[in-house]
Structure formats: C-alpha cells, structure tokens
Interface confidence: medium
C-alpha cells in the first residue's frame, strides 16, 4: 500500500504526527540549529513509524529550501536487512549521515559550513519492498549560519563633476555594520549599514564624496568580529589611482 502523509500536529520540537488506528508516523526536528561558517553542524531528525521491526529497503533523503519539492542535498539507501546506508548523493561531498536509519535516526552532519547553507532543511524516509510508505518533515529545521565579517569588495569609482566615491561590500551574519574612516572624516563613523537589498548576507556602504587624498578604511563589524580594508586616493593632474 502507498500513502502520502499529511502532518497534523506540531509541538515545540516540530514533532509532526500522522495517526490512525494501530499506527503512528511522527518526525522530530528542532526548529533551528545554529553554527559558525567553516564549522560543522548537526541537523537532528528522528522518526517513529507503524511498521514494527521494519528491515526492508529504506531510503533516507534530505532536501533544502522547501519540503517535497526542494532540491535534494543528501540521499542514501539501505538494502533489505542491511544497516549500510549507501550514500547516493552528498552535495559537494559535505553532507553525511550521522544517525542510524534502522534506529529511526536520520540526523545529518554538514561539514565546512558556508553562509549559503543558511536555509531550511527537510528530512524524509521511504520504505519499499513488502511495505511501501514514506514520510517527510513538513516544517523542517532551519540551519542558521553565523559568520564574522569579511570584506568582499572595496573600490573607488568616478562620480559626476570629477569627484570620486568609495564603495565597501562585506558579508557576515549577523549582517555587519559598516563604517568609513579617512582624511577629513575625523574619527566619526561616516556610514551606517545599508539595506540588505535582498542579497542575503551582503551589506554595502558608500562614501559619496572623497574630498581629500589619502587612505580610506572600511570597517565591518558584528558580534563575532571585525574586518578592515583600505583604498588609497591620489589625484595627479585630475586623474586618480586607487589600490587596496
């Protein structure tokens, strides 16, 4: 028999349950897991099912983004009577099963985290053979990736009326605050964080008018750290040179 499960309840652990007489599917995932970029994270997922002592073919799947339709980032399959869940897909080789599916544990380990990994993940288990059944977490677990600031670009650009402006773009989570310092700017912070503009963890700050030659420094800071980068403005006969 084949059934599509529909989640009916959820508690603080995101325990998703399907109940009917003499059988019960449920999946437990935490609402959120936090980890720092570069580190590893564990995405816990356990389940219960109505098929007592099931030892038939089994597939464990993790998706990203959205349930049921999101792209798979990990998939492994175990043959009947086998505990070896052979990995068929591990995106960029960074995903591996931490749990034992035969013990109803689909927990996943994600290595070398990047800010791009900050999204929601959904676990799924499929039974085949004598029993055909499947279940997927609908709410999933949100992986929150934090990172110290990193300045990804700093530049000087021409602007109207033979003037120059400076741009500084940084990434980090929490999104970093950006500040400029330089000639005639004193010790004051000359710019604040700009809107994120839908670019995920990227933040850009502009210094609209560079009025003096010299070194201009962009500082990016959040709760995890700070980063600095500089550009130099020298005007020769109306031309400019800028270097980082």
């Amino acid at each position: 028999f084949v059934r599509t499960k529909i989640d009916t309840t959820e508690n603080l652990l995101n325990t998703e349950v399907h109940s009917s007489p003499a059988q019960r599917w449920s999946m437990q995932v935490p609402p959120e897991v936090s980890a720092e970029a570069g580190d590893a994270a564990v995405l816990p997922c356990t389940f219960t099912h109505p098929h007592r002592h099931y030892d038939g073919p089994l597939t464990a799947i993790w998706r990203a983004g959205e349930p049921y339709a999101g792209p798979q980032v990990f998939r492994c399959a175990a043959a009947r009577g086998s505990e070896l869940c052979q990995t068929a897909l591990s995106l960029h080789g960074r995903f591996r099963l931490l749990g034992n599916p035969r013990r109803n544990d689909l927990s996943l380990r994600v290595e070398r985290l990047a800010l791009a990994d900050d999204r929601r993940y959904f676990c799924r288990v499929e039974f085949a053979g004598d029993v055909h059944d499947r279940y997927e977490s609908r709410h999933g677990v949100r992986l929150h990736v934090t990172a110290a600031p990193r300045i990804v670009n700093i530049s000087v650009l021409p602007s109207p009326a033979h003037a120059f402006r400076a741009l500084c773009t940084a990434e980090g989570e929490p999104p970093p605050a950006l500040a400029w310092s330089g000639p005639a700017l004193g010790n004051s912070l000359a710019a604040v964080r700009s809107p994120r503009e839908g670019h995920g963890h990227l933040v850009t700050a502009e210094l609209p008018a560079l009025t003096h030659d010299g070194r201009y420094t962009c500082t990016a800071a959040n709760s995890l750290g700070r980063s600095e980068a500089s550009v130099y403005l020298f005007r020769f006969h109306g031309a400019s040179g800028a270097s980082t």
Partner: antibody
Framework: QVQLVESGGGLVQPGGSLRLSCAAS????????MNWVRQAPGKGLEWVSY????????YYADSVKGRFTISRDNSKNTLYLQMNSLRAEDTAVYYC??????????WGQGTLVTVSS | DIELTQPPSVSVAPGQTARISCSGD??????VYWYQQKPGQAPVLVIY???DRPSGIPERFSGSNSGNTATLTISGTQAEDEADYYC??????????FGGGTKLTVL
C-alpha cells in the same frame, strides 16, 4: 572542551534502585543521541541503552529491559539512567557515551555501581 | 541477535603490523566500529563506519570488512598502542553489540 561526567554510582543492595546522571558540556547536547554502556570488573563492554536527541526513541539491552529507564533533560544538558530491581550482575562501571550512526565518539570516565548485600 | 567474536589476545613486535579480527553473521551488511581502551581509562573510538578514522587518530589505524569478518589493522605498531580493542555494531533489533575484546600486547 567536549566532556561527559557521570555521577550517582555507589553501593546498593540487590533489589534496590539507583539513578545515574551524566552531565554534558562543550557541545550542543540537544543535537545528539546518547547511550549508556557498562563494563563489569575485568570484563568487556556491554551496551545498556540508547535515547534519541528528542527522547522520541529509546532502546534497551535485553538484560536490562523492564528494569532500567533512560531519559534526558535537554534544558539541563543531562542524561539519566534509572536502575530498578538491581542484581549482582549489574555491578559494573557505567559510561555515558555520545553517539548514533558514527559510533560512540565521546565517552565519560564512568561511575562504579556495586550491587552487593 | 548477532554475536561478535574476537580473539582474546594478539601479540606483535614494535614496528610490525597488528591485525585484530571481529567475526559475526552477515557483518558485511553492517557498519563496524572499533574502540581502544587502556587500563583505567574510558574507551576511545579509533574507527567508525568500518573504515573511517576520527580526527586525531593516527593514520596507522585502519579498518576493513570482508565477508563476515571485520579487521582492525595497526601498521607500524607502537608501544603506546598496547590496549584492549573492542569491535561494535548494531543489530536489526536495535541492540548495540560489542565483541568480547582483544588484548593487544606489544612485545
């Protein structure tokens, strides 16, 4: 650093009860399944019980089923083993161990339980 | 339930290769884990998922699984490797099973 510290062991009479605790630190306790493993004096390792990260799944060795209960309090980063109807053959060093499909990758130093009259 | 059988003892000269076997029914369809335990200490995981090594474990430790026998191999055995070694796996009934242990003596 990652650490597990067991406590609660001691001398108990046959038929008595004891509750072991395991305090976890240095890692996100709520992300991991946990186990109890014991070792009788001069003997090998024997798995006792397993609990999933959310307490939704628990498993026991046949030798302790119905007598021992594993539990955890994720808010306190603590694992427990309630041992009832203790027998002389339960005498052992009891270890808590972090693990799941990757085996037991972190162990405590153990606590000795002696069942004797 | 599966039973894992290990030789009670294995001896090896320093610098030589030590092999410790672990046999059990249908072991080829299971993950095998190996632990090292020195006197008075807690066990330490040295091999997981049959042939993977945790960080911090020397490269001389390796694992393999063929047929119904898993093997822990220690190449270039050192005096500090003298210890008890245990294999472990899962049973389909959700029981964890350990082998009886092997005492490795470095001569």
């Amino acid at each position: 650093q990652v650490q597990l510290v067991e406590s609660g062991g001691g001398l108990v009479q046959p038929g008595g009860s004891l509750r072991l605790s395991c305090a976890a630190s240095g890692f996100t306790f709520t992300n991991y399944a946990m186990n109890w493993v014991r070792q009788a004096p001069g003997k090998g390792l024997e798995w006792v019980s397993y609990i999933s990260y959310s307490s939704s799944n628990t498993y026991y060795a046949d030798s302790v089923k119905g007598r021992f209960t594993i539990s955890r309090d994720n808010s306190k980063n603590t694992l427990y083993l309630q041992m009832n109807s203790l027998r002389a053959e339960d005498t052992a060093v009891y270890y808590c161990a972090r693990g799941a499909g990757l085996g037991y990758d972190v162990w405590g130093q153990g606590t000795l339980v002696t069942v004797s009259s | 339930d599966i039973e894992l059988t290990q030789p009670p003892s294995v001896s090896v000269a320093p610098g030589q290769t030590a092999r410790i076997s672990c046999s059990g029914d249908n072991l080829r369809s299971k993950y095998v884990y190996w632990y090292q335990q020195k006197p008075g200490q807690a066990p330490v995981l040295v091999i997981y998922d049959t042939n993977d090594r945790p960080s911090g474990i020397p490269e001389r430790f390796s694992g393999s699984n063929s047929g119904n026998t898993a093997t822990l191999t220690i190449s270039g055995t050192q005096a500090e490797d003298e210890a008890d070694y245990y294999c472990q796996t899962y049973d389909m009934t959700s029981q964890d099973v350990f082998g009886g242990g092997t005492k490795l003596t470095v001569l």
